[in-house]
């Protein structure tokens, strides 16, 4: 049952009214409108779309809609000097060249400004040398190569398949291994689901399709030239040599037709096991270099992309709260795309548009939310979450004092199997309660709740009868709000069946084939999954903005803290002798978690029983709930990652997309057995345990009775 109150209006303006106003047909129309031409960050087309969205949000009834601009570092291919990779013979002649563009899909042949596939922020360069195949280029793949197989990547060009981890981590790993260049490719094992046709006849990746994407390692910094501060007119900008997170070696992506030509000649060591072999008809030899007959041939990269400071535009819409206008609930998703953005981001942007329209309709009828709702259309997400991060940097003082929650709204779908939610534990109960009230769109679940189909298809690994909710990682616009500012955050989308579809992301991700037709023909012809995602995202925003008492349950944080403490203890216990030698103990952390659990339980009792008609008391209790996430922020940040400040969660150091719990301790323990100074290494483990202990205890104390 919704806990929201009606403000300034009759009780009919409740959650049901808001949800009923959301229409699949509108989302479909908006998606079509947003996907007819490319909207690459920093281009005129994307500026025009920003102005269109501004205009429409005003028409929908928001109180104000502003464009906020920033001048940030972006990266583009050189239009007259294209990027490509060649195989050269001993005379230096190019005997094979990779394609210069993706063949455009039918109906889009005459569209201008389709950016060719490139790795954004790659430096220029023309390295040549032998090739080494490095599987997914994960940390463990390089361990296997260097430690077990004794293969040295120094001075080599490495070729890695996309998937499993964020591409920026692959490039960082290759740099650390001494590679002089990186070739990224999409293997059919990861991007071609068996039994499905290639686009345009199905949703699989054709051989000429290529995944674009940035290869930064920003660690939450935002614009590489202005870390920590907004990239405005008076900002001090670093020189390019001091910029944050830029790769130091050339990188370029290719499709599997071109990859076949490079990989089929590979010689050297055989692949270590089947987990290193994809689905191409090639041996998947590791190298280095080509096999006997081709051993004199080399690979050469030709990369001429440029990085330039470019203006970007966010659209920020405001629906002022009637009772607590200084409390902000934010719904944000990006607008910029690599090409047409059929799924990423416009399936999300279309949902945001319809959510704004529904809220606007209620507002025109005299309703207002209790708290202020901010709507955001972020720019330059694809270039490193730049629009959202710059705006949050500019408004950080307001956000840290007033930010209640952030709900992310990138791609609404990455499949059509079941719901996928990642969020702070504070929102678990909100999500469970909301999905119990929504109807499932899934076949075979007619008349059943979304909660029921979600639980059936994606069960929690720990608790029977409940669905899985994952940790927040990064790779999307919630990052600055959650990882840097400590604002409770969540995201929801429809996803694939991870059990049967092992490929990474969806096959056409960041390719030219990510079109409106892809969605309308193959993923969601009735737009029923989009509608469900709109209901989940919109419903969360409605409850967060309108509930008298914030719909956060601190007891769920207690449960996960115990789970994460158990996990990190178990990892540490791999080294029982060192724990004894260096007197490493987790007792303090377990004690702090126990204290948190007891205090959270008592807080929940007080929350249930207090006089909700007392506005001072109500505000006080809500502030304790709002500021709980903030209490997990360490102002000093994580080691070498100052903008990742959340002590309980951070993006994994080995995969930006994944979340890691107690990341400070985890990173201190990682590969500790190979550290040259074990005493120092275990000292750092102890330091991180003490930071985690202090933070959990301090957070617990924010929930104690105020006086």
């Amino acid at each position: 049952k919704s806990s929201s109150e009606a403000t300034n209006i009759t009780p009919k303006h409740n959650m049901k009214a808001f949800l009923d106003e959301l229409k699949a047909e509108n989302i479909k129309k908006f998606l079509h409108n947003f996907t007819q031409i490319p909207h690459l960050a920093g281009t005129e087309q994307n500026f025009q779309l920003a102005k269109q969205i501004q205009s429409q949000w005003k028409e929908f009834g928001l109180d104000s809609v502003e464009l906020t601009h920033y001048d940030v570092l972006l990266s583009y291919p050189n239009k007259t000097h294209p990027n490509y990779i060649s195989i050269i013979n001993e005379d230096g002649n190019e005997i094979f060249n990779t394609s210069l563009f993706e063949p455009p899909p039918a109906g889009y042949e005459n569209v201008s400004d389709i950016v060719p596939p490139f790795s954004a922020f790659s430096p220029q360069g023309m390295p040549e040398g032998d090739l080494v195949y490095v599987n997914y280029a994960r940390t463990e793949d390089f361990f296997k190569l260097e430690r077990d197989m004794k293969i040295n990547c120094s001075g080599k060009i490495v070729i890695a398949r996309y998937g499993k981890v964020f591409r920026g981590n692959k490039v960082k790993n290759a740099q650390l291994a001494g590679a002089t260049g990186v070739i990224l490719y999409s293997d059919p094992a990861d991007y071609f689901a068996p039994g499905v046709k290639s686009y345009p006849d199905g949703w699989n990746l054709p051989g000429g399709g290529v995944q674009r994407g940035n290869i930064l390692n920003l660690n939450g910094a935002g614009d590489p030239l202005t870390p920590g501060y907004p990239a405005n007119e008076y900002a001090y900008r670093r020189g390019i040599a001091e910029a944050v997170g830029l790769p130091s070696i050339p990188v370029h992506p290719i499709g599997y037709y071109d990859a076949q030509k490079l990989l089929e000649k590979m010689g050297g060591s055989a692949s270590p096991d089947s987990s290193w072999r994809g689905s191409l008809k090639v041996p998947y030899n590791v190298g280095p270099g080509f096999t006997g007959n081709f051993s004199t041939q080399k690979v050469k990269m030709h990369i001429h992309s440029t990085s330039e400071v470019t203006r970007i535009y966010n659209v920020i819409g405001t629906l002022r709260g009637a009772v607590e206008p200084d409390r902000y609930v934010i719904l944000g998703g990006h607008r910029d795309s690599w090409v047409f953005g059929g799924i990423d981001p416009q399936s999300g942007a279309a949902v945001v548009h319809e959510i704004v329209r529904s809220f606007g309709t209620l507002k025109k009828e005299g309703w207002r939310p209790r708290r202020t709702i901010l709507f955001a259309s972020w720019d330059a997400e694809e270039f490193g979450l730049l629009g959202s991060t710059e705006w949050a940097e500019e408004n950080s003082r307001l956000l840290q004092e007033r930010g209640v929650a952030y709900i992310n709204a990138d791609s609404s779908i990455e499949g059509n199997y079941t719901l996928r939610v990642d969020c702070t534990p504070l929102m678990y109960s909100l999500v469970y309660n909301l999905t119990k009230e929504l109807e499932s769109p899934d076949e075979g679940f007619e008349g059943k709740s979304l909660y029921e189909s979600w639980t059936k298809k994606s069960p929690s690994p720990e608790f029977s009868g409940m669905p899985r909710i994952s940790k927040l990682g990064s790779g999307n616009d919630f990052e600055v709000f959650f990882q840097r500012l400590g604002i409770a955050s969540g995201r929801a989308r429809y996803t694939k069946n991870w059990e049967t579809n092992k490929f990474s992301s969806y096959p056409l991700y960041h390719s030219v084939y990510e079109t409106y037709e892809l969605v309308e023909k193959f993923y969601d012809p009735m737009f029923k999954y989009h509608l469900t995602v709109a209901q989940v995202r919109g419903g969360m925003v409605f409850e967060l903005a309108n509930s008298v008492v914030l719909p956060f349950d601190c007891r769920d944080y207690a449960v996960v803290l115990r789970k994460y403490a158990d996990k990190i203890y178990n990892i540490s216990m791999k080294h029982p002798q060192e724990m004894k030698t260096y007197s490493v103990s987790f007792d303090s952390l377990f004690s702090a978690v126990k204290n948190f659990t007891e205090i959270a339980s008592k807080f929940s009792e007080r929350l249930r029983d207090f006089d909700k008609s007392n506005p001072i008391l109500l505000r006080m209790m809500n502030d304790q709930l709002m500021f709980l996430e903030r209490a997990f922020i360490d102002p000093l940040g994580l080691p070498d990652r100052p903008f990742y400040r959340h002590v309980i969660y951070a993006p994994s150091s080995h995969n930006k997309y994944a979340g890691e719990s107690f990341p400070g301790i985890y990173d201190a323990l990682f590969d500790i057995e190979s550290k040259v100074d074990p005493s120092q290494a275990w000292g750092e483990v102890k330091r991180q345990i003490s930071i985690a202990t202090f933070t959990v205890q301090a957070a617990a104390e924010t929930l104690s009775e105020v006086a």
Epitope: Y569, N570, I571, M573, K574, P576, Q577, M579, K580, E673, S674
Partner: antibody, heavy 118, light 111 residues
């Protein structure tokens, strides 16, 4: 009381697959490494590899890498050693052992005699 | 990693002492104080006798003792008894979760 109980003796033909087990009890299975040790007839002890059941982190001795697979199921406190294609030279006694602080093998299973013969 | 070198056999009369050597390198025996010794009777599983070079688990008679000098560790059985007749193996930690076993020594109690 800490115990490691191994499955029974096996007689197999060359080329067949085999999975032998080691069930632990009396301690927290997930937080101790388990090692598998081979002893060929009349020969000494050879460490094949070790596994940490909590996250199935597995390390193989170089001469056994790619020859066998070590795994664990923490839900039933059991470690496994398996072959996809046995050879006559795999005939041996196989022990599982718990590894504890001080890098010592403090508890051992009773051993499994595997005989591979055509 | 090569196996640690032990003498194939050693013997002594009841009541006498016998010492078994275990020679490795600076990467294993010489580099760590994590040498352990195991006793194995025919048809039985090995049993821990000494750990961390010199320490004895409870239940192991005090006539078993260990020591180390440089890259060589030693196990001494003083006051030899008939039940001490068995195979003895040393093992050493070699860093990064690597372990090296000795070649084994057959101890015979004469008489």
């Amino acid at each position: 009381e800490v115990q490691l109980v191994q499955s029974g003796a096996e007689v197999k033909k060359p080329g067949e697959s085999l999975k032998i087990s080691c069930k632990a009890s009396g301690y927290s299975f997930t937080t101790y490494w388990i090692g598998w040790v081979r002893q060929m007839p009349g020969k000494g002890l050879e460490l094949m590899g070790i596994i940490y059941p909590y996250d199935s982190d597995t390390r193989y001795s170089p001469s056994f890498q790619g020859q066998v697979t070590i795994s664990a199921d923490k839900s039933i406190n059991t470690a496994y050693l398996q072959w996809s294609s046995l050879k006559a030279s795999d005939t041996a006694m196989y022990y599982c052992a718990r590894i504890t602080g001080g890098y010592l093998f403090d508890y051992w299973g009773q051993g499994i005699l595997v005989t591979v013969s055509s | 990693q090569s196996a640690l070198t032990q003498p194939p056999s050693a013997s002594g009369s009841p009541g006498q002492s016998v010492t078994i050597s275990c020679t490795g390198t600076s990467s294993d025996v010489g580099g760590y104080n994590y040498v352990s010794w195991y006793q194995q009777h025919p048809g039985k599983a090995p049993k821990l006798m000494i750990y961390e070079v010199t320490k004895r688990p409870s239940g192991v008679p005090d006539r078993f003792s260990g020591s180390k000098s440089g890259n060589t560790a030693s196990l001494t059985v003083s006051g030899l008894q008939a039940e001490d007749e068995a195979d003895y193996y040393c093992t050493s930690y070699a860093g990064s979760n690597k372990y090296v076993f000795g070649t084994g020594t057959k101890v015979t109690v004469l008489g």
